[in-house]
Amino acid sequence: GMEVRWCATSDPEQHKCGNMSEAFREAGIQPSLLCVRGTSADHCVQLIAAQEADAITLDGGAIYEAGKEHGLKPVVGEVYDQEVGTSYYAVAVVRRSSHVTIDTLKGVKSCHTGINRTVGWNVPVGYLVESGRLSVMGCDVLKAVSDYFGGSCVPGAGETSYSESLCRLCRGDSSGEGVCDKSPLERYYDYSGAFRCLAEGAGDVAFVKHSTVLENTDGKTLPSWGQALLSQDFELLCRDGSRADVTEWRQCHLARVPAHAVVVRADTDGGLIFRLLNEGQRLFSHEGSSFQMFSSEAYGQKDLLFKDSTSELVPIATQTYEAWLGHEYLHAMKGLLCDPNRLPPYLRWCVLSTPEIQKCGDMAVAFRRQRLKPEIQCVSAKSPQHCMERIQAEQVDAVTLSGEDIYTAGKTYGLVPAAGEHYAPEDSSNSYYVVAVVRRDSSHAFTLDELRGKRSCHAGFGSPAGWDVPVGALIQRGFIRPKDCDVLTAVSEFFNASCVPVNNPKNYPSSLCALCVGDEQGRNKCVGNSQERYYGYRGAFRCLVENAGDVAFVRHTTVFDNTNGHNSEPWAAELRSEDYELLCPNGARAEVSQFAACNLAQIPPHAVMVRPDTNIFTVYGLLDKAQDLFGDDHNKNGFKMFDSSNYHGQDLLFKDATVRAVPVGEKTTYRGWLGLDYVAALEGMSSQQC
């Protein structure tokens, strides 16, 4: 008949498993339960994947690995005797009197329950990495954490190379024994110990469970250190940078930590496993029964086969590791799980020209001298698209791309952003908002949804803010509906008249030139250069100002560049910015200063794109450490990451305007990085490329 082979990871667990198997057999529970001995949870997962075992109970981190690497699925979950059901919450606690937030943890003193423990280490460290707050180079998480905090107590870190920093706050027992031990000898060990570390002022933040503060304050704790503590003197750090009362853990936490769950192969019937265990718990989970499923006392251990605190086992409806873990915990695990042994020794950068090869070579040498990991190798390609092909084919690893190329890299080649560029506010030509400007006119006000039949002013055919984005957006929103991919005709029929300067006017609809005025002599009408007075962003705005058009599609800076005395030309000298408004996608109008909230799209900063299986945190970790040394254009370290003047080129490897590389944070896909509006505009235009 059918049998289920449970995988045990130790002799005591094998002993308990044997007793459970025997108890189930005597009770006539089917299918029969057998026990297989593995050497560790990891080994058991491999045995299950290899069909040499069938089931094991795992914690969240192991469920993530088992699901991601071996395709196992969770089918039965543990429920603990507490109100939060199949999970608990990892929180960061601070003293109410402090000014610490999640964004200012760098340099503060930290208290952890223990090395590699879920709420004390895995979740907070994973979250800080995944959110971009903590950069890790070369998978050396311990070094990154020891550099990040201003001293810590991480019980169990004494054996590591960074014990000076990671054990600095630990104190051992009353006689000074067991300092930094992962055991009760260290007074700051475990949930209550980490909280004590905070309460006694050794640390500034404690990473504990949602219930820890309430269990150790307001007279609920027996030890003298906690008797006078009040829960109201502590607060939780929220992910959005705010703080909350310690009772608000459902809303304010680092992650919901999933309960342990039984995992099996994808082809195993989860219902069968639950029915087996459910029969078992019905008979063997209460006091006095011959076998105790949820107790390990008889074996001199804790948490054998199941956690001792389990009150019941429940079936898991959505049997995927992602659904069980939840996005918060999943994200934290992504940030944490970085295996130095599986980290490629090189990051192969795609280069497109001789000057770029030279700069990349210098970058590789400079990084190597500073022992930055992984090392850079430079690989040539013919074009951005060729880079994408080579990255997809695993011949190259990374390349910096512009918005349109990011779209292609993501959509066609499946690449994802690993890091982005950030420019100073003065560098608006590198990343800007596309806006629709109108005159402030209370009597004839119209919205973005009412543009049909209006007169439009565009910088020029094919200009991003003047044509591609606004026309793409209007197509995507269904206002402009090209027939047979004839965008020009569709636009000419949508607007009453327009000025869209163009270089090659062959077969160009006349209404797209109807508002153009040419030069002072009336010649060169609608030409795609400055001889046409309504050419370019300044010209498109002038077209609006002089009442030729009703709406101008320009950059967010255009109105400011030509009002309030910023342009002394006669047509602009007396203009005031407050006489103009923006049309917003939601149908509203807004002040021109509200461009960040009211725009058709943002032309995004460039981003470093990689394959989805590349660890983006190691890429950013490398770039972040590198920019500390080489990011400042005036650095004395022998290489300038964001300057190309030594190579007789521009924007080599990175845009010269970059002031720093930034983590992608939550923008982990090409769509996330580009923004929905920009993607919609590109899709609107690309839908017409027949």
Partner: antibody, heavy 119, light 112 residues
């Protein structure tokens, strides 16, 4: 009318962390760039860094290893932390706004708060 | 960093007379977008700095028209057409064409 107000301890011990908060009224810190500048007694102005409308930070390379600027949008506040301070960090600390309307000049400043580093 | 050098460092002026302060940048302040990000600030005794001029020559709102700015590239000038008693203080030029923004050493204007 845009107003900025710095707050925080006026005395910090050497090697400790200086923490200041800037409370903004009359504008939202989710638009524009929000800056910290300092001025040692009797000396000139030194730029410390900014936090952008989207929460991205930039720090003057001369101070980068010791500076953190963060924000709390719910309170319309942003903060400065400067770690491992020495007597050379004694200065009046100003918060200031930069927006496109004045081409990212610092158009509104707080009144400044004097921070003395001394044991 | 871009170095901003002001002259003179001290400027005694008679009330009602004009005053001129010069500022020189170590490199051109013309940005790729064509704008020149050069500002002038006034700091009266015991007060915080106050924006006077931005983008070389644009007066900030509320600034009297006796203040004017001019210049291009690396050389810039702040002029006060007729000095008044309330103009006493230190004047700083500043650039933000390249990060980090930098300031001149300041010019102290006093009444003779």
């Amino acid at each position: 009318q845009v107003q900025l107000q710095e707050s925080g301890p006026g005395l910090v011990k050497p090697s400790e962390t200086l923490s200041l908060t800037c409370t903004v009224s009359g504008d939202s810190i989710t638009s524009g760039y929000w800056n910290w500048i300092r001025q040692p007694p009797g000396k000139g102005l030194e730029y410390i860094g900014y936090i952008s409308d989207s929460g991205i930070t930039y720090y003057n390379p001369s101070l980068k290893s010791r500076v953190t600027i963060s924000r709390d949008t719910s309170k319309n506040q942003y903060s400065l932390k400067l770690s491992s301070v020495t007597a050379a960090d004694t200065a009046v600390y100003y918060c200031a706004r930069r927006t496109l309307a004045t081409y990212y000049a610092m158009d509104y400043w707080g009144q400044g708060t004097l921070v003395t580093v001394s044991s | 960093d871009f170095v901003m050098t002001q002259s003179p460092l001290s400027l005694p002026v008679t009330l009602g007379q004009p005053a001129s302060i010069s500022c020189r940048a170590s490199q051109s302040l013309v940005q790729s977008d064509g704008n020149t990000y050069l500002q002038w600030y006034q700091q009266r005794p015991g007060q915080s700095p106050r924006l006077l001029i931005y983008r070389v020559s644009n007066r900030f709102s509320g600034v009297p028209d006796r203040f004017s700015g001019s210049g291009s590239g690396t050389d810039f000038t702040l002029k006060i057409s007729r000095v008044e008693a309330e103009d006493v203080g230190v004047y700083y030029c500043s650039q933000s064409t390249q990060v980090p923004p930098t300031f001149g050493q300041g010019t102290k204007l006093e009444i003779k």
